[in-house]
């Protein structure tokens, strides 16, 4: 009975001229992997990794397909023609054959650079804006509190000519910093400090096949 499942890197994108790692991982089975075949969209062979014979790279791809990491495959010098489906076929004993699918989209350098240039800085800009707003609110709150303490001091001094209308608005002031903290925490989930190592150490991420971050960090898979 085949109990295993193939986990793949799913839908990935990379820029023209760059490189990308294709990775499949067989889990939930004790079966021994005897061979892994990598095929392209038209089912033409890219490479084979045999447990006893090592790697066989299809000759036409020898100069731009690198074996590994692990049972995966690295495609280099990507062209627009590389866009499409890729399949990993695991021959195992005693289970038999498992198959996984990856879709690779190769983006024009200008498009990739555009999205890289504007998408990530946009997150940065938003984070910066939130920080600026937070600082501004904090400054307002601090100044307001200073004014309050000055007024209290004035009352004690017998100067009671000011009304307390302004002071009634002060309790609502601590609310923005609270929402600001939540807003600041959100970008950290998008490859911020908490997942910085995962984003930076791309190759380690694929070797370990830690899929926990795939949903939140779609640009992990690009190694251009």
């Amino acid at each position: 009975m085949m109990t295993g499942t193939i986990e793949t890197t799913g839908n990935i994108s990379a820029k023209k001229g760059g490189s990308v790692i294709l990775q499949c991982h067989l889990s939930s089975t004790m079966a021994q992997v005897t061979q892994v075949n990598w095929e392209q969209h038209d089912h033409s062979l890219l490479a084979i990794r045999n447990a006893e014979l090592g790697w066989h790279i299809y000759p036409a791809f020898k100069d731009r397909v690198a074996p590994g990491p692990g049972l995966g495959l690295t495609l280099q010098s990507l062209t627009m023609n590389d866009t499409g489906e890729y399949f990993c076929t695991y021959h195992t004993y005693p289970d038999g054959t498992y198959r996984g699918r990856i879709f690779l989209e190769v983006l024009e350098s200008s498009v990739a650079e555009h999205s890289a240039r504007f998408q990530i800085p946009l997150l940065g800009a938003m984070a910066m804006m939130l920080v600026v707003i937070c600082i501004a609110v904090i400054v307002v709150v601090v100044l307001a509190r200073k004014k309050k303490s000055l007024r209290i001091h004035s009352v004690e001094s017998g100067l009671q000519r000011k009304s307390t209308g302004q002071e009634e608005q002060i309790p609502s002031a601590p609310s923005p910093p609270g929402s600001c903290v939540q807003a600041e925490a959100a970008p950290a989930g998008l490859c911020g400090e908490q997942q910085g190592d995962d984003c930076a150490e791309l190759h380690d991420y694929f070797n370990v096949l830690s899929y926990r971050s795939l949903g939140s960090c779609s640009f992990f898979t690009e190694t251009g």
Epitope: T34, Q35, L45, I48, N50, A51, E52, L53, G54, H56, I57, Y58, P59, A60, K62, D63, H91, Y93, T97
Partner: antibody, heavy 119, light 107 residues
Framework: QVQLVQSGAEVKKPGASVKVSCKAS????????MYWVRQAPGQGLEWIAF????????TYNQRFRGKATLTVDTSISTAYMELSRLRSDDTAVYYC????????????WGQGTLVTVSS | DIQMTQSPSSLSASVGDRVTITCRPS??????LSWYQQKPGKAPKLLIY???SLPSGVPSRFSGSGSGTDFTLTISSLQPEDFATYYC?????????FGQGTKVEIK
């Protein structure tokens, strides 16, 4: 067209070594592995080893570890197999063959080199 | 090691005959099997790879089939130049091994 031309017949004494060459032409040498197979007189085919001409890495049949050593000279598109500590049962025709496009089979063969080990 | 058992070891046939040679590996090799033809004093020549694929230049009267542990080489209509010895070879593990050969002789 793809061609593999092997060096000529050799007669060696037991304990000696021999180096057989295989000159490739008609294709990009480094894109394929080179295989070596032997055939004793009147016998079947026996795979010895192959070498990846791109990386220089070799994979051997365990039976021939310490007996055969494979090398390549990419500048002249030539593969070599050196056989050491020759014995009379090493007498055979030795073939080089270019690996296949789609796996570990033998696509194009050289004409063979007869190595005779005799005292 | 994967043992390759070919049968028959020899056969006699006439020009125009349909000839079938079988090869049985000792374990599952999926479709990683090739066939070679060797004439006396000559180097072997690739006939079939991956169980059923024909390299360019090989006549279409040669065909291969099978998977797992049972493979067949068929010559649909034997020609005078087909009298030779045929070998199967697996390419699924180390060591790569060949069958002992099937000699096709003129009846």
């Amino acid at each position: 067209q793809v061609q593999l031309v092997q060096s000529g017949a050799e007669v060696k004494k037991p304990g000696a070594s021999v180096k057989v060459s295989c000159k490739a032409s008609g294709y990009t040498f480094t894109r394929y592995s080179m295989y070596w197979v032997r055939q004793a007189p009147g016998q079947g085919l026996e795979w010895i080893a192959f070498i990846d001409a791109y990386s220089g890495g070799s994979t051997y049949n365990q039976r021939f570890r310490g007996k055969a050593t494979l090398t390549v000279d990419t500048s002249i598109s030539t593969a070599y197999m050196e056989l050491s500590r020759l014995r009379s049962d090493d007498t055979a025709v030795y073939y080089c063959a270019r690996g296949g496009d789609y796996g570990w089979y033998l696509g194009v063969w050289g004409q063979g080199t007869l190595v005779t080990v005799s005292s | 090691d994967i043992q390759m058992t070919q049968s028959p070891s020899s056969l006699s046939a006439s020009v125009g005959d349909r000839v079938t040679i079988t090869c049985r590996p000792s374990e599952n090799i999926y479709t990683y099997l090739s066939w070679y033809q060797q004439k006396p004093g000559k180097a072997p020549k690739l006939l079939i790879y991956n169980a059923k694929s024909l390299p360019s230049g090989v006549p279409s009267r040669f065909s291969g089939s099978g998977s797992g542990t049972d493979f067949t080489l068929t010559i649909s209509s034997l020609q005078p130049e087909d009298f030779a010895t045929y070998y199967c070879q697996h390419h699924y593990g180390n060591p790569l091994t060949f069958g002992q050969g099937t000699k096709v002789e003129i009846k």
